[in-house]
Amino acid sequence: MGKGDPKKPRGKMSSYAFFVQTCREEHKKKHPDASVNFSEFSKKCSERWKTMSAKEKGKFEDMAKADKARYEREMKTYIPPKGETKKKFKDPNAPKRPPSAFFLFCSEYRPKIKGEHPGLSIGDVAKKLGEMWNNTAADDKQPYEKKAAKLKEKYEKDIAAYRAKGKPDAAKKGVVKAEKSKKKKEEEEDEEDEEDEEEEEDEEDEDEEEDDDDE
């Protein structure tokens, strides 16, 4: 989606992204020749971010605000190439990606946050839910993890059956070009999944089937 357009404004960066970028630059200065273990580096950054005070985070939040303003300004004048606005074909009958344990937890506690802080932005609600999840003991996370695992299992069966049948409309519409490599296909599916989860965030939680799990 517009990945190839060099004129497209660079996406806006979050305060955490700016922080990570700064960490990376610091690391490069200190160890110019060292190769970075990405997962270890990410973990260290995340730990540092968690312990930082609001004051310390402030400068990164200011950078993010400025970048958001830049992005919005540039997007106003940006004209996408023809056909670019069209979303990738998504079969409405395809099984929906299962929610994560954290997502299930959010569905449960979002009313609490919204009820106590009615004016909170979506981002701040998410932040508070993240804090709550971090404060939830492993024992209390278990029911959500169990349910998420159950839903994941079901999804894997459903997606296997769905793929076995073949994406129905896709072939008819001539969307399927040459056979893509498995890796490329998986990457695209992951992207779709991420989109699905973002869309699901906004959906009401009412249709969530409940397990009467004994803890």
Epitope: F105, S107, E108, Y109, R110, P111, K112, I113, K114, G115, E116, M132, W133, N134, N135, T136, A137, A138, D139, D140, P143, K147, D205, E208, E210, D211, D212, D213, D214, E215
Partner: antibody
Framework: EVQLLESGGGLVQPGGSLRLSCAAS????????MVWVRQAPGKGLEWVSR????????GYADSVKGRFTISRDNSKNTLYLQMNSLRAEDTAVYYC?????????????WGQGTMVTVSS | DIQMTQSPDSLAVSLGERATINCKSS????????????LAWYQQKPGQPPKLLIY???TRESGVPDRFSGSGSGTDFTLTISSLQAEDVAVYYC?????????FGQGTKVEIK
């Protein structure tokens, strides 16, 4: 004002049933874990049961498992405890409490309690 | 289940003196992921429901006088009343919320000497 008010206690014979209610007000009931805690006369506190905000997850003390059922009606801001096959050792003051789930898990708001006496 | 044991069972302290209550859990209630102790302290006065005093082992609930303080980590915890007042006469309970079932200590009765 944040408040919890229990009702439904009373005298019941061994083997009998009772349904306790707890009416919540002053907070977003549907966003909180709720619990029942009991206290036998002259004794300490005993956790009985808990229920998740949506009602999908429940937990019970071994002493009441299979006999007691916790439930909630978020549209009525009410918590329930259905007590069946009651025994003399179930005699206690039953408190409903709000569990500050996710924020700190402790029981921060308590009702005044309702007395349940199981005796023939 | 995590067992909670309080000591002493009862305590008589002069007004203005320090009162110390201990609580021991049968296993650690410290969650390594966030370095928090899942332990609370409650005060119960005769004929009243319990009242939350301390959570996270050492964080005072809002409105609780600062003469009440909590300390400890892992399995050993302490509630201290720095200068006992007449209105502090009550039974004090520790409680773990690290795992289900939630469990309470047997209680410590604080009286005035």
């Amino acid at each position: 004002e944040v408040q919890l008010l229990e009702s439904g206690g009373g005298l019941v014979q061994p083997g009998g049933s009772l349904r306790l209610s707890c009416a919540a007000s002053g907070f977003t009931f549907s966003g909180y874990m709720m619990v029942w805690v009991r206290q036998a006369p002259g004794k300490g506190l005993e956790w009985v049961s808990r229920i998740s905000p949506s009602g999908g997850q429940t937990g019970y003390a071994d002493s009441v498992k299979g006999r007691f059922t916790i439930s909630r009606d978020n549209s009525k801001n009410t918590l329930y405890l259905q007590m069946n096959s009651l025994r003399a050792e179930d005699t206690a003051v039953y408190y409903c409490a709000r569990e500050e789930g996710g924020s700190y898990g402790a029981f921060d708001i308590w009702g005044q309690g309702t007395m349940v006496t199981v005796s023939s | 289940d995590i067992q909670m044991t309080q000591s002493p069972d009862s305590l008589a302290v002069s007004l203005g003196e320090r009162a110390t209550i201990n609580c021991k859990s049968s296993q650690s209630v410290l969650y390594s992921s966030n370095n928090k102790n899942y332990l609370a302290w409650y005060q119960q006065k005769p004929g009243q429901p319990p009242k939350l005093l301390i959570y996270w082992a050492s964080t005072r609930e809002s409105g609780v006088p600062d003469r009440f303080s909590g300390s400890g980590s892992g399995t050993d915890f302490t509630l201290t009343i720095s200068s006992l007042q007449a209105e502090d006469v009550a039974v004090y309970y520790c409680q773990q919320y690290y795992s289900t079932p939630r469990t309470f200590g047997q209680g410590t009765k604080v009286e005035i000497k």
